[in-house]
Interface confidence: medium
């Protein structure tokens, strides 16, 4: 199988870990989402509704 | 030069903590890690954990996941490893090493800079 | 845990004869291997990584190859500097844990026949 992480697809420098089951991006301080797209706002509120249950932003998403 | 240099190897006690230190110099953290592996006497490579200082993030392997701290102090570009509990057989050279993350936007994940080691013997 | 396992654990080889060494991960690792020599009272050096890509100042000679779970390093034409042990190591990530790890594995001594 291809590597997933081969295309680059953590937006804003987020790291890309290649699983077997697919990919994770760990995001870089300050963003979030599964590919790293919504910046966390200052205030700490975010660009996208509430993590997930046990996610805070920037931890890795599938 | 990039340089990594290991410290605080020595004798330990039993039940104790083992503490070491690397100093890293020549290279920024934004697209490498710093990572620890040790080599018990005669044996191979042993991989404990490494740290993402860019992304304040630790990652410790699951054979030594709740003896194992590894902290940064990069004011002075430094990295500590913390073993707890130590028994004999946690007698090793003690090596960290430059973990490279990302080189030029592509995952890369060796370990292409290593300090000297630094042997830690336990025993009473 | 991944494991990943050597084969030989050591190999005897005549001067200017090819060595050849595999590495097998207990999951599929894409290309994230590298490899690794280490003499004895030394550091270990890193010679291959991304599977196949050589490290800076890393005779020709040396090469790698392979993808998924199956690896192999080849010393073209081994030299006498050439001996001590080899190590590959991987980097795998488990997303139920967010752990992200490397393993190496157990070496394999290479020495003049």
């Known amino acids: 199988r291809a590597d997933p992480c081969a295309a680059r697809p953590c937006a804003h420098g987020g790291r890309c870990y290649a699983h077997f089951s697919g990919l994770v991006c760990a995001c870089a301080p300050g963003y979030m989402g599964a590919r790293c797209e919504f910046p966390v706002h200052p205030d700490g509120a975010s660009a996208l509704p509430a993590a997930p249950p046990g996610l805070r932003p920037g931890d890795p998403q599938r | 030069e990039v340089q990594l240099v290991e410290s605080g190897g020595g004798l330990v006690q039993p039940g104790g903590s083992l503490r070491l230190s690397c100093a890293a110099s020549g290279f920024t953290f934004s697209n490498y890690g710093v990572s620890w592996v040790r080599q018990a006497p005669g044996q191979g490579l042993e991989w404990m954990g490494y740290?993402?200082?860019?992304?304040?993030?630790?990652y410790y392997a699951s054979w030594v996941n709740g003896r194992i701290t590894i902290n940064p102090d990069t004011s002075k570009n430094q990295f500590s490893l913390q073993l707890n509990s130590v028994t004999p057989e946690d007698t090793a050279v003690y090596y960290c090493?430059?973990?490279?993350?990302?080189?030029?936007?592509?995952?890369?994940?060796?370990?292409?800079?290593w300090g000297q080691g630094t042997l830690v013997t336990v025993s009473s | 845990d991944i494991v990943m396992t050597q084969s030989p654990d050591s190999l005897a080889v005549s001067l200017g004869e090819r060595a050849t060494i595999n590495c097998q991960a207990s999951q599929n690792i894409y290309s994230y291997l590298s490899w690794y020599q280490q003499k004895p009272g030394k550091a270990p050096k890193l010679l291959i990584y991304r599977t196949s890509t050589l490290a800076s100042g890393v005779p020709d000679r040396f090469s790698g190859s392979g993808s998924g779970t199956d690896f192999t390093l080849k010393i073209s034409r081994v030299e006498a500097e050439d001996v001590g042990v080899y190590y590959c190591q991987s980097y795998y990530y488990s997303s139920g844990s967010s752990y992200g790890a490397f393993a190496f594995g157990q070496g394999t001594k290479v020495e003049i026949k």
């Open positions: 740290i993402d200082p860019a992304f304040g993030r630790t």
């Open positions: 090493a430059r973990v490279a993350l990302v080189v030029a936007g592509v995952a890369y994940y060796g370990m292409d800079v």
